[in-house]
């Protein structure tokens, strides 16, 4: 049986939130006697911050839950719980295990465009042309789902001419042409782009929007019969 368990829970969760389950096995009979009935308890918590009762364990299932508010990833990113499993339903032999609880960064910061307005120039008929890179800042953990940006063109792209992807390292939004633009048909497009995260927000946060004015540049085209 494993004697070190690892689990995780988001910072700031409400008391009652389940974290993980630990299990101890006992070969003794648990049907006709209590010899094989295991009872779980938390013997100690380290660190004891903000206080020493941040977690509780279900006596019979071994499910560890948050019992107090105040989990703060910046302050304490990992807790060590010493778990006791005692057979005879709590009156017999005891064994100990360790549960390491990682406190995860909650998505409590929205990505924000900086700047919020862009102007770009694109030659007509160019497909796959990089129009503009959009920059966002996010105070959540870098490279985590709470930080990684997801971009969506909310308006202005009636002809489905544009697409936007996220750069995996810089987190910038890369706006490119999906199909060629026609200067003669429309020489300017005003796009509205919204940014969110891969992970859902844990509270109601304002969504940042950027405006991109795309000027289509005329290209001399050969006459057509």
């Amino acid at each position: 049986t494993q004697d070190t368990f690892r689990g995780s829970v988001l910072e700031g969760v409400l008391p009652g939130t389940s974290v993980m389950q630990v299990t101890a096995t006992d070969e003794d009979d648990a049907i006709y006697t209590y010899n094989g009935v295991v009872a779980y308890s938390i013997h100690s918590q380290e660190p004891k911050d903000p206080h020493d009762l941040m977690f509780t364990i279900h006596r019979s299932t071994g499910t560890i839950s948050v019992i107090s508010s105040g989990l703060d990833r910046e302050k304490v990113p990992e807790y060590t719980l010493t778990i006791q499993a005692t057979d005879m339903d709590g009156d017999g032999s005891t064994t100990t295990a360790v549960a390491v609880v990682e406190i995860l960064d909650a998505n409590d910061n929205a990505p924000m465009f900086d700047p919020q307005k862009y102007e770009a120039h694109v030659p007509e008929n160019a497909v796959g042309h990089e129009v503009q890179r959009l920059t966002v800042t996010d105070l959540d953990a870098p490279n985590s789902p709470a930080w990684r940006a997801t971009y969506l063109i909310m308006g202005g792209d009636d002809g489905d001419h544009f697409t936007i992807t996220t750069h995996p390292e810089s987190n910038q939004g890369i706006l490119t042409t999906r199909k060629g633009l026609d200067f003669e048909a429309k020489n300017q497009h005003t796009l509205y782009v919204e940014v969110t995260n891969e992970a859902p927000f844990v509270l109601k946060l304002p969504t940042s929007t950027a405006t991109i004015v795309v000027h289509v540049e005329d290209v001399n085209e050969a006459p057509v019969f």
């Epitope: 004697d3 660190p47 302050k75 304490v76 990992e78 390491v100 960064d105 953990a141 870098p142």
Partner: antibody, heavy 123, light 113 residues
């Protein structure tokens, strides 16, 4: 350039306390946790504890009762205080930076180490 | 606490040879949620501080020569130096960061013939 540097007393009498200061430069203590590790003469490495970016600490349970790690972010300094020293606490004491503040950084791995300060416990 | 056992305690090789050293953990360092092994390798040259070589059991730290390779999963790990150089004379330590307290192996001393 990331720099980590320790300063300590050198010689400590048995039953007395030890205070070591770790001064860092090139990075902020609000972004990186700092670990303390010691190495007795001719022996291996022993992890003592860590102070996280927000000031929380985790200690080696065997030393927890006589160990305190604290810091001053504005001065870029981390402090180790150990009480009731005995001769087997004689060692070189290192402070070492965690790779980052997040689990996915591999924060348990230590990427920058000071040169260490030698502490001898003797009367 | 988790016990880390390294072997051999010392070995002597000639320049250019391939060398492997072992690190065993008293229990698995593989976390199922992210499929990562919480293990690091360090190099400590005589009179110097330890230097991080490998983390996540196999990820080479920036600036570490590619002759150093970490491998393994669960409880059994290996550090390989593909072609030893004279400057590799050092003690090599493994360290687990799966559980507190973090613990180090006893070290493998690499000597050059």
């Amino acid at each position: 350039v990331q720099l980590v540097e320790e300063s300590g007393p050198g010689l400590v009498a048995p039953s007395q306390s030890l205070s070591i200061t770790c001064t860092v430069s090139g990075f902020s203590l609000t972004s990186y946790p700092i670990n303390w590790v010691r190495q007795p003469p001719g022996k291996g490495l022993e992890w003592l504890g860590v102070i996280w970016t927000g000031g929380g600490t985790n200690y080696d349970s065997a030393l927890k009762s006589r160990l305190t790690i604290s810091k001053d972010n504005s001065k870029s300094q981390v402090f180790l205080k150990m009480n009731s020293l005995q001769t087997d606490d004689t060692a070189r004491y290192y402070c070492a930076r965690s790779r980052g503040a997040y689990d996915f950084d591999g924060r348990g791995a230590m990427d920058y180490w000071g040169q260490g300060t030698t502490v001898t416990v003797s009367s | 606490e988790l016990v880390m056992t390294q072997s051999p305690s010392s070995l002597a090789v000639s320049v250019g040879e391939k060398v492997t050293m072992s690190c065993k953990s008293s229990q698995s360092l593989l976390y199922s949620s992210n499929q990562k092994n919480y293990l690091a390798w360090y190099q400590q040259k005589p009179g110097q501080s330890p230097k991080l070589l490998i983390y996540w059991a196999s990820t080479r730290e920036s600036g570490v020569p590619d002759r150093f390779t970490g491998s393994g999963s669960g409880t059994d790990f290996t550090l390989t130096i593909s072609s030893v150089k004279a400057e590799d004379l050092a003690v090599y330590y493994c360290q687990q960061y799966y559980s507190y307290p973090y613990t180090f192996g006893g070290g493998t001393k690499l000597e050059i013939k």
